[in-house]
């Protein structure tokens, strides 16, 4: 079930070719678009095996992220692909192309993408409305504890600046549906709820609209009863990996609990050819667990490093507390080195995805 | 708070069983597994083995095997330890303990104890 | 089946650092946790997970494992501190336990 969803306008794909070496290519996409970042060898000769890098990190294919030897593919790209690119040989680590990539949730117009930023830089902003801090909005499921108080965002912009509603639930929300009413700081795009109550729960939307279009964000807030429970985990994480053979990876785990939790990652394992015991429980080891001088941060995050083909399998991010616990797998699929992929692209399969 | 509250000292002679309670307040029962752990008078710390209270499922060391039986009652979140044809080596203090493995798995590396009961003494003696 | 070795004794004044050290095959491949057990008493944990530190223990405890060691440290060592402590790690499905080492804070 998704806890939090974001209505998205598909674009087109828009191909870019890169840039000379040591120019950065400055790019703007839409939310849903598909980035294709194209990195030709410089002066058409052959160029040898090529790595794709984000943000520092060797990207790993898989069905979103199609990486070929000079092309780059993100499909129904998000906020969370905005970043710096680069194209790099393999051996050398020589820096082939480099792309910096802004991802927003107004869908890209269809014009030149080049000098989008710029003019954005300029205070001409594109006519529908966007997100000017998606980053802050990417906590889509809030899990407070009564008496809290609560503020969703979400700040925007466009030409003309565009109003901002809520609804609860899919229904218009005014200040008199609650007791305590509400405030609505439309300066700072926000929605205010002081000490919340179990009936606070529900789906919180925005609509940012103009005259040019609407965009929208929903947020779930669960108020946590005084009565504690078990933790909750945030749906959709882990997320299922796919990583190439000696690459890093994580897995992600969101935890809400008013009580303290205590965290665990375990792998599945088998055992004399079996994958569960003798009572029907999967074999598992530990592979992290929560310490009092481990911060959440850390605990959230279980980091793969060189993977090999026998890390591949099934995760699980296990989390309780007093009353009980929850626990959410993911399983992660280690496919052959590069180089292979590069083999079987030049033999016309373009993409290992 | 998590409690762990063992049944009191029990005196048997050779040959005869005894059977220690252990009995959990503070956290759900049936989460996590629970262990035994004795201690021989002036001697060091012995894995007996565990109980998983969810499922029933158990697992037990070597040396107690054939002589000991771990069983539980979720009912009243009490575990217990049953050790037959008992022989004044046996004499100890039993510790129940509950060990930070969840009981929807089957754990190949065991974690450590973060609660220990106060323990029972049994004395075997003719 | 993996055997824990730990010295039977360790003396240290106080103030100073303690450290008890804890032998298996290949430990440092595994978790090793550490309790501490004063006369008459339970038990009580220390360390886990190699160097992890429950609430509540304080912050002169510490822990580190690799090779075939496991070591407990004790910094600027109490008289408090006096007890017996045990080492403790897995092997496949069961739990082994080290013969443990008494620690002496002298004067």
């Known amino acids: 079930e998704s806890l939090g969803t974001e209505q998205r306008v598909v674009g087109r794909a828009a191909e870019v070719p890169g840039p000379e070496p040591g120019q950065q290519e400055q790019l703007v996409f839409g939310s849903g678009d598909a980035v294709e970042l194209s990195c030709p060898p410089p002066g058409g000769g052959p160029m040898g095996p090529t790595v794709w890098v984000k943000d520092g990190t060797g990207l790993v294919p898989s069905e979103r992220v199609l990486v070929g030897p000079q092309r780059l593919q993100v499909l129904n790209a998000s906020h969370e692909d905005s970043g710096a690119y680069s194209c790099r040989q393999r051996l050398t680590q020589r820096v082939l192309c480099h792309f910096s990539v802004r991802v927003t949730d107004a869908p890209s117009s269809g014009d030149d993408e080049d000098g989008e930023d710029e003019a954005e830089d300029t205070g001409v902003d594109t006519g529908a409305p966007y997100w000017t801090r998606p980053e802050r909005m990417d906590k889509k499921l809030l899990a407070v504890p009564a008496a809290n108080t609560v503020r969703f965002r979400c700040p925007a912009a466009g030409n003309p600046t565009p109003s901002i509603s809520w609804l609860k639930n899919g229904r218009e929300f005014r200040g008199e549906h609650r007791i305590g009413g509400i405030k609505l700081r439309h300066q700072q795009w926000s929605l205010v709820m002081e000490s919340v109550v179990p009936s606070d729960r529900g789906n919180y939307t925005c609509v940012v609209e103009n005259k040019f279009g609407s965009i929208r964000q929903t947020y779930t807030l669960d108020v946590l009863e005084r009565s504690p429970h078990r933790p909750i985990l945030q749906a959709g994480l882990p997320a299922n990996q796919t990583a190439v053979l000696g690459s890093d990876v994580e897995f992600h785990c969101k935890v809400y609990s008013d009580a303290q939790p205590h965290i665990q990652w375990l792998k599945h394992v088998e055992v004399n050819g079996s994958k569960v015991g003798p009572d029907g429980t999967p074999y598992v080891t530990v592979l992290k667990t929560a310490g009092a001088n481990t911060t959440d941060k850390e605990l959230e995050v279980l980091s793969l490093h060189n993977v090999t083909f026998e890390d591949a399998g099934e995760y699980t991010c296990l989390a309780g507390n007093s009353i009980g616990f929850s626990h959410h797998s993911a399983w992660l699929v280690v496919l052959p080195a590069e180089e292979e992929l590069v083999e079987a692209d030049e033999a016309g399969s373009v993409y290992a995805g | 708070q998590v409690q762990l509250v063992q049944s009191g000292a029990e005196v048997k002679k050779p040959g005869a069983s005894v059977k220690v309670s252990c009995k959990a307040s503070?956290?759900?029962?049936?989460?996590?597994?629970m262990h035994w752990v004795r201690q021989a008078p002036g001697q060091g710390l012995e894995w007996m083995g565990w109980?998983?209270?969810?499922?029933?499922?158990?697992n037990y060391a070597q040396k107690f095997q054939g002589r000991v039986t771990m069983t539980r009652d979720t009912s009243i979140s009490t575990a217990y330890m049953e050790l037959s044809s008992l022989r004044s080596e046996d004499t100890a203090v039993y510790y129940c303990?509950?060990?930070?493995?969840?009981?929807?798995?089957?754990?190949?590396?065991?974690?450590?104890?973060?609660?220990w009961g106060q323990g029972t003494l049994v004395t075997v003696s003719s | 089946d993996i055997e824990l070795t730990q010295p039977p004794s360790v003396s240290v004044a106080p103030g100073q650092t303690a450290r008890i050290s804890c032998s298996g095959d290949?430990?440092?491949?595994?978790?090793a946790s550490w309790y501490q057990q004063k006369p008459g008493q339970a038990p009580v944990l220390v360390i886990y997970?190699?160097?992890d530190r429950p609430s509540g223990i304080p912050e002169r405890f510490s822990g580190s494992n690799s090779g075939n060691t496991a070591t407990l440290t004790i910094s600027g060592t109490q008289a408090e501190d006096e007890a017996d402590y045990y080492c403790?790690?897995?092997?496949?499905?069961?739990?082994?336990f080290g013969g443990g080492t008494k620690l002496t804070v002298l004067g």
């Open positions: 303990a509950r060990n930070m493995a969840y009981t929807n798995y089957q754990y190949v590396n065991m974690p450590h104890f973060d609660y």
């Open positions: 503070g956290y759900t029962f049936t989460s996590y597994y």
């Open positions: 109980i998983n209270p969810n499922s029933g499922g158990t």
């Open positions: 290949a430990l440092g491949d595994k978790y």
């Open positions: 997970d190699d160097s």
């Open positions: 403790q790690s897995y092997d496949y499905f069961k739990l082994v």
